[in-house]
Interface confidence: low
């Protein structure tokens, strides 16, 4: 069998909301993957599991099942959304993300994704990790790849 290539393209959009009382930020982050099947037979994309980390803490997880199949020598672009929550010991970020007199609201997030594919009863997992910049101060739609090159607030360690 030939390889199945998974390429993490980047953040497609990030939609933000806030809970004032809890000083909590909710970010729905939609990511884009390209999955290429280099084989002469179809493969099934069985599931995608993803998680997002901020300051070495997991702030969101998602799992998509029975997603699609990819034909021979074909490629499919797949979007998946991870709901994330920045709260509790990271509530100091609430000020940063919501204050108008702060000009730059980008934060750095670690995106981790694992794609499980199957063909002829055989299962294969491919994982990717990428640091991405996301604006936590407003709803943002990114051109693909754009979120890799923004100014960023480094999280407090």
């Amino acid at each position: 069998p030939r390889s199945i290539d998974v390429k993490y393209i980047g953040v497609k959009s990030a939609y933000v909301s806030y809970d004032v009382q809890k000083r909590t930020i909710y970010l729905n982050i939609t990511n884009t993957l390209n999955i290429t099947n280099n084989n002469y037979y179809s493969v099934e994309v069985e599931n995608i599991t993803a998680q997002v980390q901020f300051a070495k803490t997991v702030i969101g997880k998602a799992r998509l099942n029975n997603i699609t199949h990819i034909g021979p020598l074909d490629m499919k672009q797949i979007d998946y959304t991870v709901p994330t929550v920045i709260a509790e010991e990271m509530s100091y970020m609430y000020d940063f993300c919501t204050l108008i007199s702060i000009k730059v609201h980008n934060i750095v997030l670690m995106m981790q994704v694992t794609v499980t594919t199957t063909y002829f009863g055989h299962s294969e997992q491919i994982s990717q990790e990428r640091y991405q910049y996301v604006d936590c101060g407003r709803n943002t739609t990114y051109q693909l790849g754009q979120s890799e090159y923004l100014n960023v607030l480094q999280p407090q360690q």
Epitope: T98, L99, K103
Partner: antibody
Framework: QVQLQQPGAELVKPGASVKLSCKAS????????MHWVRQRPGQGLEWIGN????????HYNHKFKDKATLIVDKSSSTAYLQLSSLTSEDSAVFYC????????????????WGQGTSVTVSS | DIVMTQATPSIPVTPGESVSISCRSS???????????LFWFLQRPGQSPQLLIY???NLASGVPDRFSGSGSGTAFTLRISRVEAEDVGVYYC?????????FGSGTKLEIK
């Protein structure tokens, strides 16, 4: 220690322009917004605008949009307020003041002020 | 623009007394993040303004704890307990929530 040095006075003729300086020392110039405030004789304080020295991003009070231009020179850690088409109405003391800015403006506004430059517009 | 109103132009006070200076805003200064973006400054005669209080109730560095700030989203009070002679000057409130930032007209504290 943090210091904002401003010249004491400027005498300008009506219709002319003036460029007021505010030299910063004792802190990283590019990490803090610089604000400018006007105080006419016997009057209160009016916010003119602010500038982020790291990239010259500015916000103006619309009242001063055609009168004031904010500039910075990073190499000398100096902020400038340029005032144009001066009239007697523009006679005032002009203060510069810094506040934390960029990523970290959590609201500690204008914690250090210059001594102010008194501008007199007279022929 | 947000209008800041200081309705009392001057307050005469005897040293050792307490005094409250009020300020109102035309719009709530309570931000979605829970902070209230109101500041108090003192301008002593012939001097530059000095920051006293930030975010409505936080004492600025080096300011005596005789000063305190309180309020709601639109009504604010600066309280000075045990007024001293050095407290004379004009007290200004300022909103820092929205551009353009705006000051109140000031309240002059005078010693009787």
């Amino acid at each position: 220690q943090v210091q904002l040095q401003q010249p004491g006075a400027e005498l300008v003729k009506p219709g002319a322009s003036v460029k007021l300086s505010c030299k910063a020392s004792g802190y990283t110039f590019t990490n803090h917004w610089m604000h400018w405030v006007r105080q006419r004789p016997g009057q209160g304080l009016e916010w003119i605008g602010n500038i982020d020295p790291s990239d010259s991003d500015t916000h103006y009070n619309h009242k001063f949009k055609d009168k004031a231009t904010l500039i910075v020179d990073k190499s000398s850690s100096t902020a400038y307020l340029q005032l144009s088409s001066l009239t007697s109405e523009d006679s005032a003391v002009f203060y510069c003041a810094r506040s934390r800015g960029g990523y970290y403006d959590y609201g500690e506004a204008m914690d250090y002020w210059g001594q102010g430059t008194s501008v007199t517009v007279s022929s | 623009d947000i209008v800041m109103t200081q309705a009392t132009p001057s307050i005469p006070v005897t040293p050792g007394e307490s005094v409250s200076i009020s300020c109102r805003s035309s719009k709530s200064l309570l931000h979605v993040n829970g902070n209230t973006y109101l500041f108090w400054f003192l301008q002593r005669p012939g001097q530059s303004p000095q920051l006293l209080i930030y975010r409505m109730s936080n004492l600025a560095s080096g300011v005596p704890d005789r000063f305190s700030g309180s309020g709601s989203g639109t009504a604010f009070t600066l309280r000075i307990s045990r007024v001293e002679a050095e407290d004379v000057g004009v007290y200004y409130c300022m909103q820092h929530l929205e551009y353009p930032f705006t000051f109140g007209s000031g309240t002059k504290l005078e010693i009787k």
